[in-house]
């Protein structure tokens, strides 16, 4: 197993609507054609797994048809959006990329993206 | 357990076909790259191919390239080797072959093996 | 012709040290692939041994260790026993063959 740099963004802020987007960057090494991609989330010193996909270089990213994330690949970068968010999702969310095939085999993880939800304030009653 | 099961060995005729499937359990099996390994009697391994966790790259050794046809069915668990105008050199056991996570560049798991001879 | 070069027999007595080389090219170990080493015993899958040119995994004593330079390897098995005694096969990564590569096998005899 091979080191890897990753960098991503330090800060980022969820939409209202609960979306937050950042760009996941890998110095690749090596000549890589299929890329693992996994955004962890610390909270509490806990760690879960978020979503994960697996794409080929120069093709889309595939999340599964239920995941929270979606993205875009371009060269070495990753354009990660992760929707659904609220107040208590608010985090660290990690990057770990690893180069899969062919050898050798590379792991990177980023420092993390601490993003902060806040929930929209309701709409107060109208009377007319 | 991690397990890899391969199948579909047997005796066939010079220029005949054969695909050997090789059932895998245990582990992730979509994440990783697997791998044909075959060993003729008496002699070394030789690597014969791999294909990538999604199928999408696909190497061959020299010695079997445009002849066999690696594939992989991660719905299934399955990894097959589709051997075609089969000649005596191919005589060897197959084990299809992998690796554990962390571990990802050396084989730590490989099947029990599947002998295929080439005789008339 | 194996790609990588392994002397075919080595042998020792028990409580031995024995060195099993593995010489490869630019392309393979010369190129910064880490080499693996395989131990298969009479009738069996072979079983991985150390990889990443020197790391073992669980299970295997610390008796056998391993180490890479440049364009060759070697594997070393110190204080021999009459178990140890197999087939041992360096592989690497092949850049210009796009597959891996074995070595052609060393018979391990303990004498």
């Known amino acids: 197993c091979k080191a890897m740099h990753v960098a991503q963004p330090a800060v980022v802020l969820a939409s209202s609507r609960g979306i937050a987007s950042f760009v996941c960057e890998y110095a690749s090494p090596g000549k890589a054609t299929e890329v693992r991609v996994t955004v962890l989330r610390q909270a509490d010193s806990q760690v879960t797994e978020v979503c994960a996909a697996t794409y080929m270089m120069g093709n889309e990213l595939t999340f599964l048809d239920d995941s929270i994330c979606t993205g875009t690949s371009s060269g070495n970068q990753v354009n990660l959006t992760i929707q659904g968010l609220r107040a208590m999702d608010t985090g660290l969310y990690i990057c770990k990329v690893e180069l899969m095939y062919p050898p050798p085999y590379y792991l990177g993880i980023g420092n993390g993206t601490q993003i902060y939800v806040i929930d929209p304030e309701p709409c107060p009653d109208s009377d007319f | 357990e991690v397990q890899l099961l391969e199948s579909g060995g047997g005796l066939v005729q010079p220029g005949g076909s054969l695909r050997l499937s090789c059932a895998a359990s245990?582990?992730?099996?979509?994440?990783?790259?697997m791998s044909w390994v075959r060993q003729a009697p008496g002699k070394g391994l030789e690597w014969v191919s791999g294909i990538s966790g999604s199928g999408g790259y696909i190497h061959y050794a020299d010695s079997v390239k445009g002849r066999f046809t690696i594939s992989r069915d991660n719905s299934k668990n399955t990894l097959y080797l589709q051997m075609n105008s089969l000649r005596a050199e191919d005589t060897a056991v197959y084990y299809c072959?992998?690796?554990?996570?962390?571990?990802?560049?050396?084989?730590?798991?490989w099947g029990q093996g599947t002998l295929v001879t080439v005789s008339s | 012709q194996s790609v990588l070069t392994q002397p075919p027999s080595a042998s020792g007595t028990p409580g031995q040290r024995v060195t099993i080389s593995c010489t490869g090219s630019s392309s393979n170990i010369g190129a910064g692939y880490d080499v693996h080493w395989y131990q298969q015993l009479p009738g069996t899958a072979p079983k991985l041994l150390i990889y990443?040119?020197?790391k073992r995994p669980s299970g295997v004593p610390d008796r056998f260790s391993g180490s890479k330079s440049g364009t060759s390897a070697s594997l070393a098995i110190s204080g021999l026993r009459s178990e140890d005694e197999a087939d041992y096969y360096c592989?690497?990564?092949?850049?210009?063959?796009?597959?891996?590569?074995f070595g052609g096998g060393t018979k391990l005899t303990v004498l």
């Open positions: 592989a690497a990564w092949d850049d210009s063959l796009n597959g891996w590569v």
């Open positions: 245990g582990f992730t099996f979509s994440s990783y790259a």
């Open positions: 990443d040119n020197n």
């Open positions: 072959a992998t690796y554990s996570s962390g571990l990802h560049d050396a084989f730590d798991i």
